[in-house]
Amino acid sequence: FEIALPRESNITVLIKLGTPTLLAKPCYIVISKRHITMLSIKSGERIVFTFSCQSPENHFVIEIQKNIDCMSGPCPFGEVQLQPSTSLLPTLNRTFIWDVKAHKSIGLELQFSIPRLRQIGPGESCPDGVTHSISGRIDATVVRIGTFCSNGTVSRIKMQEGVKMALHLPWFHPRNVSGFSIANRSSIKRLCIIESVFEGEGSATLMSANYPEGFPEDELMTWQFVVPAHLRASVSFLNFNLSNCERKEERVEYYIPGSTTNPEVFKLEDKQPGNMAGNFNLSLQGCDQDAQSPGILRLQFQVLVQHPQNESNKIYVVDLSNERAMSLTIEPRPVKQSRKFVPGCFVCLESRTCSSNLTLTSGSKHKISFLCDDLTRLWMNVEKTISCTDHRYCQRKSYSLQVPSDILHLPVELHDFSWKLLVPKDRLSLVLVPAQKLQQHTHEKPCNTSFSYLVASAIPSQDLYFGSFCPGGSIKQIQVKQNISVTLRTFAPSFQQEASRQGLTVSFIPYFKEEGVFTVTPDTKSKVYLRTPNWDRGLPSLTSVSWNISVPRDQVACLTFFKERSGVVCQTGRAFMIIQEQRTRAEEIFSLDEDVLPKPSFHHHSFWVNISNCSPTSGKQLDLLFSVTLTPRTVDLT
């Protein structure tokens, strides 16, 4: 190899060891029998050398640095050449460095031809191995603007007082042009301006200077976004830190065309603007930091550009002004992440503050819109608390548990609507009465409706789930001892059509001691399946539950248990079941931890089934499933 550098070229070539392949033996640069591991060639020098190994690219790297002095004479503006040409260099990983020094008053602009640049964060690498590292200068301090790959949106970077650009090319890369030019500009009066151009839908992730280290104190950095007028842009902060300010405040400023309040100033912790049409600027302003404990200011953010959806021009009014103790959250439904570009899906408050989730609270009227390509990516979860503090005032009072029509009219699927029903301890209990009788969901007879009610205790220390219930069964009412949550959960978009079937009334009733009482009025047509609460986890210790089962005059009920033994093993106390005829008060008592469960039995009159648990040993829980079937009395039962 021969490298000859012209005089006055201000180019230095340095060949040095990279990260060695540890299993290999050392490779050397050989110059007339001398073996060396570092070779520096300066302007005006000509050196002939070889390598002592077959694959020097596994051992050495080459750095070509050109110093461009704009202080003492005119600046060589225009397209930047790769000198010496890559064809004259040994095939090593190579880094071309241009170090431009200029006066503080002169602005320098790097212009990148297509493909534009894409900024990468710490630990990331470029797929083709070609990286652009750009840094600036504040007095004598070097400031890293960022590291960039090809195929992005960054088209121009403006700086002043000097710029250092390093282009890293892997040894196998055929590139023989720099891909950028330098132009002079008037002073930009800030650290730098980065221009990011979107031709169509897409996203860009950008970072403050020196990221992930701290942004220079009291500096200003601007990003200019060029967005076609027919598209919408949204900004979201992925990661940020604030420093400890002594004077001034760290902030971001937006210049949004058409806004009457330019510049719009936001704190970094604020929700950032979304649904912006056309071009806009974003600036990051630092502060004077506390000398003793400066902290660091840093910001990583994403700009998402996409087509406005039909929905984005529609305003939905959610009137919660007459509601109390209620919150509505619109959020993304969980999905597997895909690797391709996915347009953002945002919900916007007052059309401007857009984010991937939004919580609305009672007491106000809210105006919302959507910036989303597919609204099935979102769902709604609502919580409402109905509480009684004064038992004298609440007793016999009823509340309808219905999803308000405002919520049903939103173009987003309702997932859960939860009512938390709170009563004064040991004073009142609750009764749930459905508009349509309910079926308990079991493996034997699953619910196939578009929604179900999930009923569970709302006492933090109590792990008690009564079950999942849907319309179209035989359960006429559910009485519960104390605080519960009732969640209407939807399973299909057809809930909108079936919404009329929902309807549950809760009433506050005098206190009773049992954990729950189910009133069951079976239909002649079908078998009713019932199971103990907390199925799969076991009925909680010392808990008692009852079923009040009605048998019409002309019918006989067959009560069948689905296993021979309960399987419960008691640590303390006894587990028992009482089956009691309501008319005669005759009762049968079964010890669940000892006896076998009763064989199928026939009941001519309404009867009670009461199950009371002991304190079971772990793993030996009480789970019972039974069925009730009605048959006409005229049939010979022998």
Partner: antibody, heavy 116, light 106 residues
Framework: QVQLVQSGAEVKKPGSSVKVSCKAS????????MNWVRQAPGQGLEWIGW????????IYDPKFQGRVTITADESTSTAYMELSSLRSEDTAVYYC?????????WGQGTLVTVSS | EIVLTQSPATLSLSPGERATLSCSAS?????LYWYQQKPGQAPRPWIY???NLASGVPARFSGSGSGTDFTLTISSLEPEDFAVYYC?????????FGGGTKVEIK
């Protein structure tokens, strides 16, 4: 298991030559530079030169140039160091070692005594 | 040729103490190697490529440095660490050794 086994001790007259051998096992000498160093009694280590068995290229410390010849026989995985025109100050333990970026394998040393 | 100067020539310390051995090059070197030698034995590879411990070397040893100044540090001396340590450069031939530092029991 990696080993470098050197030939036995030698007593030589001034002006004569000595040829020390170094047989490698457990690794391929083509993947290493085969170096020779010496250590005079109570002194430090002094690098003499090396051979790259892959291409038979050699480098010698200018101090030994003209007096030393390092060779290698790939078929027997053996490196040799011959030092001529011996003087009493050449009395030392001569070590061979194979070197790569990461691994360095040393022989046990061969004592060469030059005495009239 | 690159001259390597090791200092101090002798280091007298007690077990448990920290030892700092220095190796200074007359011109810049890419990487440095360190060897340990005990009386009557061949040198043993100790640190390669400036800071990597050779196989079997305890973690109390560490190597650092760049350019012309390099250091081998033993955080807490054990009885078996008392020996002579040599540095060597592989950056430019002849591939010289330093004069050695003897670490002896005080």
């Amino acid at each position: 298991q990696v080993q470098l086994v050197q030939s036995g001790a030698e007593v030589k007259k001034p002006g004569s030559s000595v040829k020390v051998s170094c047989k490698a096992s457990g690794f391929n000498i083509k993947d290493y530079y085969m170096n020779w160093v010496r250590q005079a009694p109570g002194q430090g280590l002094e690098w003499i030169g090396w051979i790259d068995p892959e291409n038979a290229n050699t480098i010698y410390d200018p101090k030994f140039q003209g007096r030393v010849t390092i060779t290698a026989d790939e078929s027997t995985s053996t490196a040799y160091m011959e030092l001529s025109s011996l003087r009493s100050e050449d009395t030392a333990v001569y070590y061979c070692y194979g070197s790569s970026y990461r691994f360095t394998y040393w022989g046990q040393g061969t004592l060469v005594t030059v005495s009239s | 040729e690159i001259v390597l100067t090791q200092s101090p020539a002798t280091l007298s310390l007690s077990p448990g103490e920290r030892a700092t051995l220095s190796c200074s090059a007359s011109s810049s070197v890419s990487y440095l190697y360190w060897y340990q030698q005990k009386p009557g034995q061949a040198p043993r590879p100790w640190i390669y490529l400036t800071s990597n411990l050779a196989s079997g070397v305890p973690a109390r040893f560490s190597g650092s440095g760049s350019g012309t100044d390099f250091t081998l540090t033993i955080s807490s001396l054990e009885p078996e660490d008392f020996a002579v340590y040599y540095c060597q450069q592989w950056s430019s031939n002849p591939f010289t050794f330093g004069g050695g530092t003897k670490v002896e029991i005080k």
